[in-house]
């Protein structure tokens, strides 16, 4: 049964067995077509999600479509049915939370009161002022807390007590890739993870322990991509895994934060990564308790020097690492997470590639998951 | 070396058609994107279309959609360019252009030497 | 399209003179701007990238400045291979545009 299982695939209708590597190569080997049905799915960008949240202090704002303008969102008459209805248009399911926050003195944009139409936020037609003087802050989901927090350091073995959103994706039982926790259903990795092995029924989700091999497997149903664009191929590597059945949060598997759409760090900025990856490039192993380090935000223009990857470095990535080099993520690390720490900590990048491990010119290259929140919002919306 | 070639440029009459080809070697001509650049005499230079690395997507300037048509051979390294209803205001030295990145076409780094189309009657 | 323009269109210096072109976009590109130098007869050929990396084997003498909508490209001692035409391009979004052009000429 194991070796029928590893090696070959059921057709129904009639019942007969094909070679497993015949799964998700686009041909249809299976009268039904079942071959091709569980295998790796591209999901277009989709249009602009017309609601968002801002750094300051997660405040809601809502697009006008009529003129591409956004709006914040004021308080007056903003119910719980107005913050389910804008969580929902992010794809979230889960039970939101808001209060009201001051409107600061550096506020830019027009506040409006919202109300709701066809399931979507709209801007009040006779929107007078905004009379509480207060905005929306919004939170779809409780995330990005850990029990522990990390100590300021090089490299160092890591607790899934302080990063209880990191998971190990396996292919045949073997480590393939990082990924991290966004809600009870939803675990945040890169693409390239997928390039080998395109077929979903092998693929599975370890989460809650630090040890590679001591926590049990989660079958996966779905693995979303995002469309390939041609002109920019190194572009869009980020993915979505569905997962058959929900998490249930405990201290050691929580969700961690999607980054605000407007969360522009700084060079310096500091961030972690995790991930059970080489421990030395070519290294030949993996290691097999989590480790942890502390980075910070390389600047963009300065990674695309001649030096370093001569201009290779576009706008839907970030770089970090550490200026001297010798701390970075590795082969194994991929598609795991880039965490940046306000009040809570927040997913802004992915384990995308890089030139070798840990060179001072060369530091880890990033998805930057900002540049995609419309996308994993519009997927998770697909699926509610 | 990267080294671009173009050819097929010459003297044209008001409303016909050419093909510009340009040879590609010193690079994986395969994973670059690539563009079609040109400059009137004495002007200023004039972006006019690009291809992406597997020829699926293309983007042209206004001043030539619907008249040129860039395309390529990969087999060959070769990038093409096929001109119809040509104008006087085409005439210029026409050049074929290299991405630095393959992750994304918009910055160009090398240049072929030109072909020089003239327009005229 | 976004529209580049370039000052001055013309410049007449010396040999070791320090030598100053902008260039303004119609709306914000980033750090998206590239600088080229084009001799008579020539392809151009690329200096400066991402407004202020320098292009390998150009020499240092060039340097790049500026973010947002307003860019400067510096000779900061003249020599005389450099005289020649420069042009700006925005490398932002499609279509691809160029300045007009900044031809430096020997006084």
């Known amino acids: 049964k194991v070796i029928l299982d590893k090696y070959y695939f059921l057709c129904g209708q009639p019942l007969h067995f094909i070679p497993r590597k015949q799964l998700c190569d686009g041909e249809l080997d299976c009268p039904l077509g079942e071959d091709e049905e569980h295998c790796v799915k591209s999901f277009p960008e989709g249009p602009a999600v017309a609601v968002r949240l801002s750094k300051d202090r997660s405040t809601l704002q809502v697009l006008d479509s009529a003129t591409g303008n956004w709006f914040s969102a004021c308080f007056d008459n903003f119910t719980e049915a107005l913050a389910e209805t804008a969580c929902r248009q992010m794809g979230y399911s889960s039970k939101p939370t808001f209060r009201a926050v001051e409107i600061g003195p550096d506020q830019d944009l027009d506040v409006v009161e919202i109300t709701e139409n066809s399931q979507e936020l709209r801007m009040r037609n006779s929107s007078g002022p905004c009379l509480s003087g207060s905005l929306v802050s919004l939170h779809c989901l409780a995330c990005g807390k850990s029990l522990k927090t990390p100590r300021v350091v090089g490299v160092e073995e890591a607790s899934v007590d302080s990063w209880p959103w990191q998971v190990s994706i396996q292919y045949d039982k073997q480590h393939v890739c990082g990924g991290s926790i966004l809600d009870p259903h939803w675990v945040l990795t890169a693409a390239h993870c997928f390039r080998k092995h395109t077929d979903v029924f092998n693929w599975k989700v370890r989460a809650g322990s630090d040890k590679l091999g001591s926590f049990p497997s989660l079958a996966v149903a779905k693995i979303i991509i995002i469309e390939f664009n041609p002109m920019y191929p190194k572009d869009n590597d980020i993915a979505l895994m569905k997962l058959q059945f929900p998490l249930t949060f405990s201290g050691t598997v929580r969700p961690i934060c999607l980054p605000f759409f407007d969360e522009e760090l700084t060079p310096a900025t500091p961030l972690w990564i995790i991930g059970w990856g080489f421990t030395k490039q070519n290294g030949g192993k993996m290691s097999d308790i989590l480790l942890q380090a502390s980075v910070q935000v390389i600047d963009s223009t300065r990674c695309n020097a001649d030096d370093a990857y001569q201009g290779e470095v576009t706008e839907k990535m970030m770089c970090a690492g550490i200026p001297e080099g010798g701390v970075d993520t590795c082969q194994g690390d991929s598609g795991g997470p880039l965490m940046y720490q306000s009040d809570q900590w927040h997913v802004v990048g992915i384990v995308s590639w890089g030139y070798g491990c840990g060179g001072p010119s060369t530091p880890g290259v990033y998805t930057k998951v900002s540049a995609y929140l419309n996308w994993i919002y519009n997927v998770w919306k697909a699926e509610l | 070396e990267v080294q671009l070639l173009e050819s097929g440029g010459g003297l044209v009459q008001p409303g016909g058609s050419l093909r510009l080809s340009c040879a590609a070697s010193g690079f994986t001509f395969s994973s670059y994107a690539m563009h079609w650049v040109r400059q009137a005499p004495g002007k200023g230079l004039e972006w006019l279309a690009v291809?992406?690395?597997?020829?699926?997507?293309?983007h042209y300037a206004d001043s030539v959609k619907g008249r040129f048509t860039i395309s390529r051979d990969n087999s060959k390294n070769t990038l093409y360019l096929q001109m119809n209803s040509l104008r006087a205001e085409d005439t210029a030295v026409y050049y074929c252009?290299?991405?630095?990145?393959?992750?994304?076409?918009?910055?160009?780094?090398?240049w072929g030497q030109g072909t020089l189309v003239t327009v005229s009657s | 399209d976004i529209q580049m323009t370039q000052s001055p269109s013309s410049l007449s210096a010396s040999v070791g003179d320090r030598v100053t072109i902008t260039c303004r976009a119609s709306q914000g590109i980033s750090n998206s701007l590239a600088w080229y130098q084009q001799k008579p007869g020539k392809a151009p050929k690329l200096l400066i990238y991402?407004?202020?990396n320098l292009q390998s084997g150009v020499p240092s003498r060039f340097s790049g400045s500026g973010s947002g909508t307003d860019f400067t490209l510096t000779i900061s001692s003249l020599q005389p291979e450099d005289f020649a035409t420069y042009y700006c391009?925005?490398?932002?979004?499609?279509?691809?545009?160029f300045g007009g052009g900044t031809k430096v000429e020997i006084k």
């Open positions: 391009q925005q490398a932002n979004s499609f279509p691809l545009t």
């Open positions: 991402s407004a202020v």
């Open positions: 252009a290299k991405p630095k990145a393959s992750s994304g076409p918009r910055l160009i780094d090398y």
């Open positions: 291809i992406s690395f597997d020829g699926s997507i293309r």
